[in-house]
């Protein structure tokens, strides 16, 4: 059985204020069951962007269909981007579990703001 | 076994079209990403087109944008890339590739056809 | 762009590597062509991932923006290009290609 890997293909993507972000990942397997959450930063301190399974985050949409069956596709697109939403953001695979448990973080795409074209 | 078989390719003249297609078999050819690659004589590969799963997304090389459609019947297990506006530089060995969880990355090829352009 | 160097040689029965760097990839995979024209093989995907089919003498591994194909045992039959792939649209897609040469 091949290693589950989290697949974020860009090192980093550059977006004008005011557009739409589309932030890319992948997985490699469906198992073990659990959520993927995307976080800005790391460690202790890393903020919550997105939970594919709970909260409402109303900037951010998933490219594809979450209820469609085998998606690994775990793209996200968040709208509206100012500058204080640069940073690098990380998807990571947890297991299901009480608490979920982290098993696997993509490798991490830095987002940058461009000015709004005049 | 996965196979990808391309059509015929052939000669045409500067400005006509060309539509190829490549069959599918031994994969669930509905739940996978499909690309075009090509090779033009003497050169590397070249990424031309890729189509999503489900065919509502489509992606281009800026070489070929808005002069070829890629597109897909997936009750048919088939490929499609209508070719206009051809050009010398065209001139290829075009390659169906099937990509494997993330849409850059290829896991099995066709044989390839030639596209020929030339006056 | 992705870079790669235009040609390496090896010794039968010896190790080669192969690398390719740069652009905005985070991810790399790896393509054999026999001969110019004929249809490419798939030999890496996603760094580290070899197909079923292919041989464990090779092999990938990435570390920051590089990416390497190592063949250890190298066999007559590997004299080939050697493609490196990115994950990053923005990158093209392919390297121009390494000519591995069987010594």
């Known amino acids: 059985e091949e290693e589950l890997q989290v697949i974020q293909p860009e090192k980093s993507v550059s977006v004008a204020a005011g557009e739409s972000a589309t932030l890319n990942c992948t997985a490699t397997s469906l198992i073990p069951v659990g959520p993927i959450q995307w976080f800005r930063g790391v460690g202790p301190g890393r903020e919550l962007i997105y939970h594919q399974k709970e909260g409402h985050f109303p900037r951010v949409t998933p490219v594809s269909d979450p209820t469609k069956r085998n998606n690994m596709d775990f793209s996200i697109r968040i709208s509206n981007i100012t500058p204080a939403d640069a940073g690098t953001y990380y998807c990571v695979k947890f297991r299901k579990g009480s608490p979920d448990v982290e098993l696997k973080s993509g490798a991490g795409t830095e987002l940058s703001v461009r000015a709004k074209p005049s | 076994d996965v196979q990808l078989v391309e059509s015929e390719g052939g000669v045409v003249r500067p400005g006509e079209s060309l539509r190829l297609s490549c069959e599918a078999s031994g994969f669930t050819f509905r739940n996978s990403y499909m690309t075009w690659v090509r090779q033009a004589p003497g050169e590397g590969l070249e990424w031309v087109s890729t189509i999503s799963d489900t065919g509502d997304t489509a992606y281009y090389a800026d070489s070929v944008k808005g002069r070829f459609t890629i597109s897909r019947d997936n009750s048919k297990n088939s490929l499609y890339l209508q070719m206009n506006s051809l050009r010398a530089e065209d001139t290829a060995i075009y390659y169906c590739?099937?990509?494997?969880?993330?849409?850059?990355?290829?896991?099995?090829w066709g044989l390839g056809t030639l596209v020929t352009v030339s006056s | 762009a992705l870079t790669q160097p235009a040609s390496v040689s090896a010794n039968l029965g010896g190790t080669v590597e192969i690398t390719c760097s740069g652009g905005?990839?985070?991810?790399y995979g790896w393509y054999q062509q026999k001969s110019p024209g004929s249809a490419p093989v798939t030999l890496i995907y996603a760094d580290t991932n070899r197909p079923s089919n292919i041989p464990s003498r090779f092999s990938g591994s990435t570390s920051g923006s590089t990416s390497t194909l190592t063949i250890t045992g190298v066999q007559a039959e590997d004299e080939a290009v050697y493609y490196c792939g990115g994950s990053s649209t923005g990158d093209g897609i392919f390297g121009a290609g390494t000519t591995l040469t069987v010594l």
């Open positions: 905005n990839s985070n991810h």
């Open positions: 590739a099937k990509s494997w969880i993330w849409w850059t990355f290829f896991d099995y």
